[in-house]
Interface confidence: medium
Amino acid sequence: SEVEYRAEVGQNAYLPCFYTPAAPGNLVPVCWGKGACPVFECGNVVLRTDERDVNYWTSRYWLNGDFRKGDVSLTIENVTLADSGIYCCRIQIPGIMNDEKFNLKLVIKPAKVTPAPTRQRDFTAAFPRMLTTRGHGPAETQTLGSLPDINLTQISTLANELRDSRLANDLRDSGATIRIG
């Protein structure tokens, strides 16, 4: 079943997807599409990279991370309820039927009527734990602050509720990751 990610109407949604290039600059083509991954390619493509660069994108879809290092996580800007659904991240590894396919379910919730105080401040101010990313060469470890124990699924859900979350790079373990080569 698909991993589920949440965001509120009007916020930016974050759908994680990663791979590790075999060598620096050896980019693997990736496509993002709306709808579950078909047998080949992506249906309803919203963004595409190739061996060189991002070669196609539509207005509200972009990559915030360093896609040249394999962070191909999708950001969807200013989401509406219509953005709910399954998204396909397809890492198009050369060779027959070598592609890695990840289906991610995005659930959009109506915006809260009463705005809460900035959760980003609350979240970053409260966290005694360390998060270590994997699959990207040397591990990156960052102290985030101080909050009681919380699992990565919860962290991922919180992260999706943060507009333009600066914590996204520290949440890679909750997303799809594949090592190439």
């Epitope: 060189r52 660069d53 991002v54 070669n55 990559l63 360093d66």
Partner: antibody
Framework: QVQLQQWGAGLLKPSETLSLTCAVS????????WSWIRQTPGKGLEWMAE???????DYNPSLKSRVTISVDTSKNQFSLNLTSVTAADTAVYFC????????????????WGQGTLVTVSS | SSELTQDPAVSVALGQTVRITCQGD??????ASWYQQKPGQAPVLVIY???NRPSGIPDRFSGSSSGNTASLTITGAQAEDEADYYC???????????FGGGTKLTVL
Amino acid sequence: QVQLQQWGAGLLKPSETLSLTCAVSGGSFSGYYWSWIRQTPGKGLEWMAEINHSGDTDYNPSLKSRVTISVDTSKNQFSLNLTSVTAADTAVYFCARGSRRGRYFPQPFDFWGQGTLVTVSS
Amino acid sequence: SSELTQDPAVSVALGQTVRITCQGDSLRSYYASWYQQKPGQAPVLVIYGKNNRPSGIPDRFSGSSSGNTASLTITGAQAEDEADYYCNSRDSSGNHVVFGGGTKLTVL
């Protein structure tokens, strides 16, 4: 439709400071990088600096010592200061939206201000 | 070098096809964007990414890329296409924006 409206002094003396401001309307301000680009008479375009709503900046290395870019998110505005101007800084200055939203995303400039001619003369 | 190099001037007969090129080391890793600028006006984005046109740009404009060279092709050039054309991309380090020197297109 996104619109960029720019203004600032058009005539300066050598050694003075050039100051320009660009106001953005009709679209998201926080989602983008915003740049200043200049065009000297009869010559090409030269990118000068960029900034996003968080205040993250990048500068053309050849101008970095003299250029400051700043942002006022409450007004959806960003500004350029260029110190110690000379006649070589006489140019049309444009503000523009870079549709590169992420640090590593491609950088086409899809919306531009009308341009401000700045003349440096004693 | 982080610079992008363009031919200063190119001409084309009305209705014919013309290709404007942009060369630079960084174009091996980054796609160029292309802008059209007419006298007294701000530049207008005509091609971005591999070969994408913003809305309102006629389909006679197309982009391509090979090695360290990006190309803008106008198929069936019209009188209103007479303008200066600029390419831009990142520099080789990926850290800064760079523009080509521009190509003046004359439609004969």
